[in-house]
Every structure is written in structure tokens, then in C-alpha cells.
Interface confidence: low
């Protein structure tokens, strides 16, 4: 069952899925000039069995003024540059951390993709929150949302994250620790 | 389930000028990519003009391309259509649709690749 909405949004905040749940699928978006080759998936699905788990189809993007040539999915160090969620994928390094049973990992980047990946959640699938550059995090409880089916209908719970304006961002489960909280608790006791 | 509905359709001269606006609820309106399609008396029901998630990507069908401009307010959950130097033969009901498939910069969408349709509102250009 797919989650209706988006999670929440924490103000100064980004969420980013540890891993994602079987069912979910990723829009095959391409950035401006180019377009999904014809013969390609419009979306990539996390598929499998109990054993494991992986993304069906690959995205493709092509130029849209070379009709004929289809771009390999290998990303080019620039284009990886202009996506805007690179800065947090390289700050995760979550997916070759990751195997939970039922799950994918994320999904390398395609060439000129597009900067901004739209993911449609399945109903179980938690996502966690991050303070961006420049904010710290101050927890009342765990900074995640989980997407639930409550009276036929999905919600996402409320992530208890409040970004404030210091300088060290916060940190996904299973990064390493830069210093520790005011409070004491870890940073990265996020996902407990 | 999304639900979309359309306004703004009326009665207006050739050459005059009209807004659609279609109003999107009850999904993540965000992930959708959005698209107006029209059906004339006795005609299929045609491509008009979409837009991506990000409103990078717009599509025009040529009939319409340099008069009518598609654009979408995510805040507002609004997609808008204005309609400019209209036409007798742009008299149809125009359907506000929205899918999560992703738009392509140069492939026009089908109708049959919309999941979500509202009602439509008319509109009629007399000459």
C-alpha cells in the first residue's frame, strides 16, 4: 500500500530512507534537456524475495536534442555535482551499511538525472531526519517518521526534531558521531 | 485517491484571453506531474499541455503552443492554464489529469496514462 502523502517537514531539516521497503518505486526523472529514453522504465521498483532485494528496471536519461543516443546510466563526476541530494548521500554512506531483509538500498545515480528524486513509500517505511549544514538538533524524542495505516488511511508519524541555528548538523543512524549532544545523548540516536 | 477539480471555463470571444485552474487534494500532490486535455463536440479527448513535478518540464501540443501556458503552485496544490488569443476551434470541456509517472521533455502524454481526472469545465470561444 502506498503512503498518500510525503513525510512531514521539519523546518532546517532533510529526511533521507536508510533503506527502502519492497514496493516502493523511484520516478525515472531526467533534468532539464534530456528525457527518459523511450523504451525505459518510467520508475524503479524495490522488488524481491525474503532472501533479497533490489531495484527493478534502470532509469535512463537521453538528450533531447540527440534523439538516437541513449546516455549510459554511469553518472559523470559533474552531473553528480548537480544533484542537489548528493551532499547527503555522500554525507550518509548508509547504503553499503544497510541489508535489512525486505529492503533495497539506494539507488546509484543515473547520468543526468534529475536534482530532486521522488520516491513513493510503502506503508512500514521509516525515514530520518537530519538537520541541514549550519543547524544542530535538539531531540524530544526520535527524529524519524514511520508511514502507518490507521482507519483505512496512511499518515506519517511526527518526527521530534527541532533544527536550531548552530553550526554542527545532526547525524543519520550508523554515521559516526562528531561530538555529542548538550544533553548528552548521541547525535545519531536518532532511529532507537 | 486524488481528487482534482477544474474552474474557470466560460464563454469568451475569439481572440479574448481565459484561465483554468484545477484544484488537486487528497494525495501527494507534489509527485504528481499534471496535465489539461480537451474534448471537442464529436472529437477524442486530445493532449493540451502538462508539467513535471519540479515544473521543469512542459509540454505543449502544437495547436496550443505560444498561446496557452501551463504552470502549477505546490503550495496551493493549483495547476493553472491560461488561455490566450483563443480560438473558435478551442471550444471543448478541458479535464485537469494528474499521474506519478514521469514527464518526459519530449514525449506528449496519453490520456490513458492519467489515473486522476476531474470533471471538466467548458469552454466555449465564439467568433
Known amino acids: 500500500e502506498l503512503c498518500d502523502d510525503d513525510p512531514p517537514k521539519i523546518t532546517h531539516a532533510t529526511f533521507k530512507a536508510v533503506a527502502y521497503k519492497e514496493g516502493t518505486m523511484l520516478n525515472c526523472e531526467c533534468k532539464r534537456g534530456f528525457r527518459r529514453i523511450k523504451s525505459g522504465s518510467p520508475y524503479m521498483l524495490c522488488t524481491g524475495n525474503s532472501s533479497h532485494s533490489s531495484w527493478d528496471n534502470q532509469c535512463q536519461c537521453t538528450s533531447s536534442a540527440a534523439r538516437n543516443t541513449t546516455k549510459q546510466v554511469t553518472p559523470q563526476p559533474e552531473e553528480q555535482k548537480e544533484r542537489k541530494t548528493t551532499e547527503m548521500q555522500s554525507q550518509m554512506q548508509l547504503a553499503d551499511q544497510v541489508s535489512l531483509p525486505g529492503h533495497c538500498r539506494e539507488p546509484p545515480p543515473w547520468e543526468n538525472e534529475a536534482t530532486e528524486r521522488i520516491y513513493h513509500f510503502v506503508v512500514g517505511q521509516t525515514v530520518y531526519y537530519q538537520c541541514v549544514q549550519g543547524y544542530r538538533a535538539l531531540h524530544r524524542g526520535p527524529a524519524e517518521s514511520v508511514c502507518k495505516m490507521t482507519h483505512g488511511k496512511t499518515r506519517w508519524t511526527q518526527p521530534q526534531l527541532i533544527c536550531t541555528g548552530e553550526t554542527e548538523p545532526s547525524q543519520f543512524p550508523g554515521e559516526e558521531e562528531p561530538q555529542a549532544s548538550p544533553d548528552g545523548l548521541p547525535e545519531s540516536e536518532t532511529s532507537r | 485517491q486524488v481528487q482534482l477539480v477544474e474552474s474557470g471555463g466560460g464563454l469568451v470571444q475569439a481572440g479574448g484571453s481565459l484561465r483554468l485552474s484545477c484544484a488537486a487534494s487528497g494525495g501527494t500532490f507534489r509527485t504528481r506531474n499534471m496535465g489539461w486535455f480537451r474534448r471537442a463536440p464529436g472529437k477524442e479527448r486530445e493532449f493540451v499541455a502538462a508539467v513535471s513535478w519540479n515544473v521543469d518540464n512542459k509540454l505543449y501540443a502544437d495547436s496550443v503552443k505560444g498561446r496557452f501556458t501551463i504552470s502549477r503552485d505546490n503550495g496551493r496544490n493549483m495547476v493553472y492554464l491560461q488561455m490566450n488569443s483563443l480560438k473558435p476551434e478551442d471550444t471543448a470541456v478541458y479535464y485537469c489529469?494528474?499521474?506519478?509517472?514521469?514527464?518526459?521533455?519530449?514525449?506528449?502524454?496519453?490520456?490513458?496514462?492519467?489515473?486522476?481526472w476531474g470533471q471538466g469545465t467548458q469552454v466555449t470561444v465564439s467568433s
Open positions: 489529469a494528474a499521474d506519478n509517472i514521469p514527464l518526459s521533455s519530449d514525449m506528449r502524454p496519453t490520456a490513458t496514462e492519467y489515473d486522476y
